[in-house]
Interface confidence: low
């Protein structure tokens, strides 16, 4: 099957890192500098992504794979393939249109990115607050008084607060 396919389509012989050059009788030509082809049989090479400004190069472009970018310190990636860089905030803050703002009382953010999320409401399930929440940390729910038999305790608090997304830094 491969042999037949090759006879019908000479371009199928061109490996990744090359392109099928119609101007040169469909021979396989290497991708020019700053371009790549990640699969065989391609008729053009794609231009390498440039990691500029707030983006920095995480992986250099090669003839067979595109460059990969991440963000300079103080910023984190957003979107597929790090299509955007967003400013970091401190723990206990969230990014708004007006910049980094402290979490409101009753909310927290334990990451440099993402939004402030509500503290877990321990009382909804009859649990007590073992450790109070802060802007940076969720509350820790402890057992209800009925759970406090020797050597036993509950670890199940109610109403989970979101785990903020993980910054690549």
């Amino acid at each position: 099957f491969e042999r037949t396919r090759s006879l019908q389509d000479p371009c199928s012989n061109c490996p990744a890192g090359t392109f099928c050059d119609n101007n040169r009788n469909q021979i396989c030509s290497p991708c020019p500098p700053n371009s790549f082809s990640s699969a065989g049989g391609q008729r053009t090479c794609d231009i390498c992504r440039q990691c500029k400004g707030v983006f920095r190069t995480r992986k250099e472009c090669s003839s067979t794979s595109n460059a990969e970018c991440d963000c300079t310190p103080g910023f984190h990636c957003l979107g597929a393939g790090c299509s955007m860089c967003e400013q970091d905030c401190k723990q206990g803050q969230e990014l708004t249109k007006k910049g980094c703002k402290d979490c409101c009382f009753g909310t927290f953010n334990d990451q440099k990115r993402g939004i402030c999320r509500p503290w877990t409401n321990c009382s909804l399930d009859g649990k007590s607050v073992l450790v109070n929440g802060t802007k940076e940390r969720d509350v820790v729910c402890g057992p209800s008084p009925a759970d406090l038999s020797p050597g036993a305790s509950s670890v199940t608090p109610p109403a989970p607060a979101r785990e903020p997304g993980h910054s690549p830094q």
Epitope: D110, R137, T156, P157, P160, A161, E163
Partner: antibody, heavy 119, light 107 residues
Framework: QVQLVQSGAEVKKPGSSVKVSCKAS????????INWVRQAPGQGLEWMGN????????NYNQKFKDRVTITADKSTSTAYMELSSLRSEDTAVYYC????????????WGQGTTVTVSS | DIQMTQSPSSLSASVGDRVTITCRAS??????LNWYQQKPGKVPKLLIY???RLHSGVPSRFSGSGSGTDFTLTISSLQPEDVATYYC?????????FGGGTKVEIK
């Protein structure tokens, strides 16, 4: 009682993908995070990522971010972990484990799924 | 990522001995530290959460302490059924990370 039941052992070729399932019962599936933790033979535990089934919000360990996809099906109370571009060092037992909120512990674990990557 | 370092990596003690395992975090994790027990060929089980809180059904001979970067798991009187590998895990920051484990054997 709370149970996390995982799919059976898999043998895979290098470069292929594997998808492991974790069926939850005995609690409200949408209220807890499902985490995936792996353990290579004779090695320690390594957290891969998690999902909040209520809205399919995910967090990934950057080490696996390009190769792992975690999904959840609320209708069947089942979470899935798919690992692609397998290599021999991905041979491990893969566990799903439940947690309730960010800093709380993994209180219930699945029985583990052995994935062997061999040519 | 926060690195979790356990010591010793293995130990051998007699039944009835007091056994101490330490776990050190590469940065301050407050009290967000959990301990798990994994018996040979078995699934990890939660022992202690939030540094010192015993999980349901865990014998009172197990205890935990510490804060910040240094934590301890203590078995006050080692029993044959305590033969296992013990792991610490931080719940402070993503990604969740585990210590390398401490294997406990009976002399």
């Amino acid at each position: 009682q709370v149970q996390l039941v995982q799919s059976g052992a898999e043998v895979k070729k290098p470069g292929s993908s594997v998808k492991v399932s974790c069926k939850a019962s005995g609690y409200t599936f949408t209220s807890y995070w499902i985490n995936w933790v792996r353990q290579a033979p004779g090695q320690g535990l390594e957290w891969m990522g998690n999902i909040y089934p209520s809205d399919s919000y995910t967090n990934y360990n950057q080490k696996f971010k390009d190769r792992v996809t975690i999904t959840a099906d609320k209708s069947t109370s089942t979470a899935y972990m798919e690992l692609s571009s397998l290599r021999s060092e991905d041979t491990a037992v893969y566990y799903c484990a439940r947690l309730y909120y960010g800093s709380s512990p993994f209180d219930y674990w699945g029985q583990g799924t052995t994935v062997t990557v061999s040519s | 990522d926060i690195q979790m370092t356990q010591s010793p990596s293995s130990l051998s003690a007699s039944v009835g001995d007091r056994v101490t395992i330490t776990c050190r975090a590469s940065q301050d994790i407050s009290n967000y530290l959990n301990w798990y027990q994994q018996k040979p060929g078995k699934v990890p089980k939660l022992l202690i959460y939030h540094t010192s809180r015993l999980h349901s059904g865990v014998p009172s001979r197990f205890s935990g302490s510490g804060s910040g970067t240094d934590f301890t798991l203590t078995i006050s009187s080692l029993q044959p059924e305590d033969v296992a590998t013990y792991y610490c895990q931080q719940g402070h920051t993503l990604p969740r990370t585990f210590g390398g484990g401490t294997k406990v054997e009976i002399k």
